[in-house]
Amino acid sequence: QEDEDGDYEELVLALRSEEDGLAEAPEHGTTATFHRCAKDPWRLPGTYVVVLKEETHLSQSERTARRLQAQAARRGYLTKILHVFHGLLPGFLVKMSGDLLELALKLPHVDYIEEDSSVFAQSIPWNLERITPPRYRADEYQPPDGGSLVEVYLLDTSIQSDHREIEGRVMVTDFENVPEEDGTRFHRQASKCDSHGTHLAGVVSGRDAGVAKGASMRSLRVLNCQGKGTVSGTLIGLEFIRKSQLVQPVGPLVVLLPLAGGYSRVLNAACQRLARAGVVLVTAAGNFRDDACLYSPASAPEVITVGATNAQDQPVTLGTLGTNFGRCVDLFAPGEDIIGASSDCSTCFVSQSGTSQAAAHVAGIAAMMLSAEPELTLAELRQRLIHFSAKDVINEAWFPEDQRVLTPNLVAALPPSTHGAGWQLFCRTVWSAHSGPTRMATAVARCAPDEELLSCSSFSRSGKRRGERMEAQGGKLVCRAHNAFGGEGVYAIARCCLLPQANCSVHTAPPAEASMGTRVHCHQQGHVLTGCSSHWEVEDLGTHKPPVLRPRGQPNQCVGHREASIHASCCHAPGLECKVKEHGIPAPQEQVTVACEEGWTLTGCSALPGTSHVLGAYAVDNTCVVRSRDVSTTGSTSEGAVTAVAICCRSRHLAQASQELQ
């Protein structure tokens, strides 16, 4: 390997004479932070992404980079600026000694610095059978729309673009940013270099084994012949896509990221920026049989993160590992023994497994949905993917016990028709990260920018919690759950819905003086109740039992424990109607559920009473689940009686709008 120091020594010598006494001090009170990969073998010390504050211009980025070089040179250090970022994130990529980090963190405009790290390919024909609605036969799989209006970007290995399965469908861009292969005796065999990317391109758009047979693709090489890349190379690839989008705006874009590395703040931030520019990003959850939230880009909330299941809808096992899981996974898709184009020859096929293959399926489905409805936003697309998924088919016993409730039991499927879903009120459940066990710990769950938070609930495995409340944060409602003394921590659970032209607010009633319990209702004209939350300051609510059923004619009312403050989510939207549905069980039971009927969507899920033996409430698809402590510890007293309260809504306005379109 060539010694690169020669050419960057030259660069730095030229800068030694530059006046660097002008360095501005960082803005008062702000401290830039340093981040690095939690997985030691994946770290790449010596290369750093310096991320600058959001409004920093390109010229300022260049100036900051030069200043770093000049200051480093004065201390006798060599540095090399490898890339200046602009378009997605302001900043630069620098090769330098870790000794200079303290200096770099003090530079003007610096927001944070992240050490570079590795990312990896995530791979080790029932697949069309599973994603195809029953009315199609997989052997004659002719999708209603092949995704022809959509361009899918693939960030992966090199690919054999003239393979018979994908010829003419994939444009290989001139983008390449890959690390050297490991090992001195590594032999670059073209067919192996192309293996991962060729297979995935085939899964997305292959003529015979592809999901979206009409989709055109563009490939960027960010993984080397061993399937290894870097966070920085992936960032530069995402920036390339953004610049291409600005130079030549086309129709909808889907970006497939069939790779994973350790949690990366900067990679997640870049994904967020690209998603907010209207690009749909789909990524592999990872093949580490671990919480997907520990990996990037899987942990980026704006990205559609896909886990892998097999022909029997079971989570995929890959050697000693398997698919990742947890709250950062949006849904699962076929990812075991997936047939696709093989780079071994121009007509060869091979089966590969992994969350890369699963992500490719979802990218194909997304391309078809966007081709049918090009105006769909990311939020609308995600909600549709969830809505049309096969529900509750995965055997959750495969997941660690503490992850089962957090992991979506959804397997991606094509909609029976790519049109006509517009009338539906779509909602999804978003779990927060765990709060941690400290007394005042809280957890926050957020909806996507163009979703409405219609209700908020909380859950604690120990039952020690102080409820939840909806509160404004940055001009948007969030769901915050509160831990209690001695609790092991809580989760906040947001119900996030697509409700165009909605005007929602939260009405709060403080703890009641009287023994009747606390009540709050939606008093504004035309506002309907979409969710109820309760929050209390006391450590234990005790056994006070408020009246469970609402007085007749008062459906817009939340009731709760007299020592709790009650929060009602009240919304006004064209044609929105909601009703309360309750299911009470007099005897103690670990789980009580109540579901909304066909045509109605669950927006709110809460428990009555809010006493401490209730672990919490959460929505699973259209069912409200209330969990209580183990009945053996509760006894069969009246304290064990629990009611699950669902609020079910529908939008007549959306239904009419869709009928007018048809």
């Epitope: 054999q160 673009s161 003239d162 018979r164 010829e167 003419g168 003529r207 121009s346 007509t347």
Partner: antibody, heavy 115, light 109 residues
Framework: EVQLVQSGAEVKKPGASVKVSCKAS????????ISWVRQAPGQGLEWMGW????????NYAQKLQGRGTMTTDPSTSTAYMELRSLRSDDTAVYYC????????WGQGTTVTVSS | ESALTQPASVSGSPGQSITISCTGT?????????VSWYQQHPGKAPKLMIY???NRPSGVSNRFSGSKSGNTASLTISGLQAEDEADYYC?????????FGGGTKLTVL
Amino acid sequence: EVQLVQSGAEVKKPGASVKVSCKASGYTLTSYGISWVRQAPGQGLEWMGWVSFYNGNTNYAQKLQGRGTMTTDPSTSTAYMELRSLRSDDTAVYYCARGYGMDVWGQGTTVTVSS
Amino acid sequence: ESALTQPASVSGSPGQSITISCTGTSSDVGGYNSVSWYQQHPGKAPKLMIYEVSNRPSGVSNRFSGSKSGNTASLTISGLQAEDEADYYCNSYTSTSMVFGGGTKLTVL
């Protein structure tokens, strides 16, 4: 405009070899290979094989039995088909076409094998 | 590979519709979405008319349509015109290669 331009007609003696060229233009070369198809007088079309501009890989029809060699020269955007040990029944019009999909065809090259 | 089976000839009057069949096996026509149809006028190179069973390249009249059922593919030409008189060939993928039909001569009466 996507175009495939083939070399001119050839007259060869039995046992000789012929090399037909096909120059491609107007598209991204590496996205497609080149198929070779021949048509004997008054007969149908016969697929002979395929060659890659991307990596030079080939896929030959069984009938060629090692008599044919297909190559590409990406620097000149040209594909070649060489046929050795010519026989009279190799007399045909030889076409190159873009990829396996054969969506664009060359004008054809007449090869006559006659003693 | 054996050639796909096509009728040697079909004929029709101007304005009529005709259908040309192309029968193969589950290893070619029945096993792939990639059946193509070509038109060839005398002394000219073939021209792609239908690809991937039923798709028309831009510039090809919508009077030409393709379909497939099991191991048989079909080309239908509606509103027959004099310039449609030509030879028509079907083509399919096989596992490792490509196979053509024997060709059908279309005569416009």
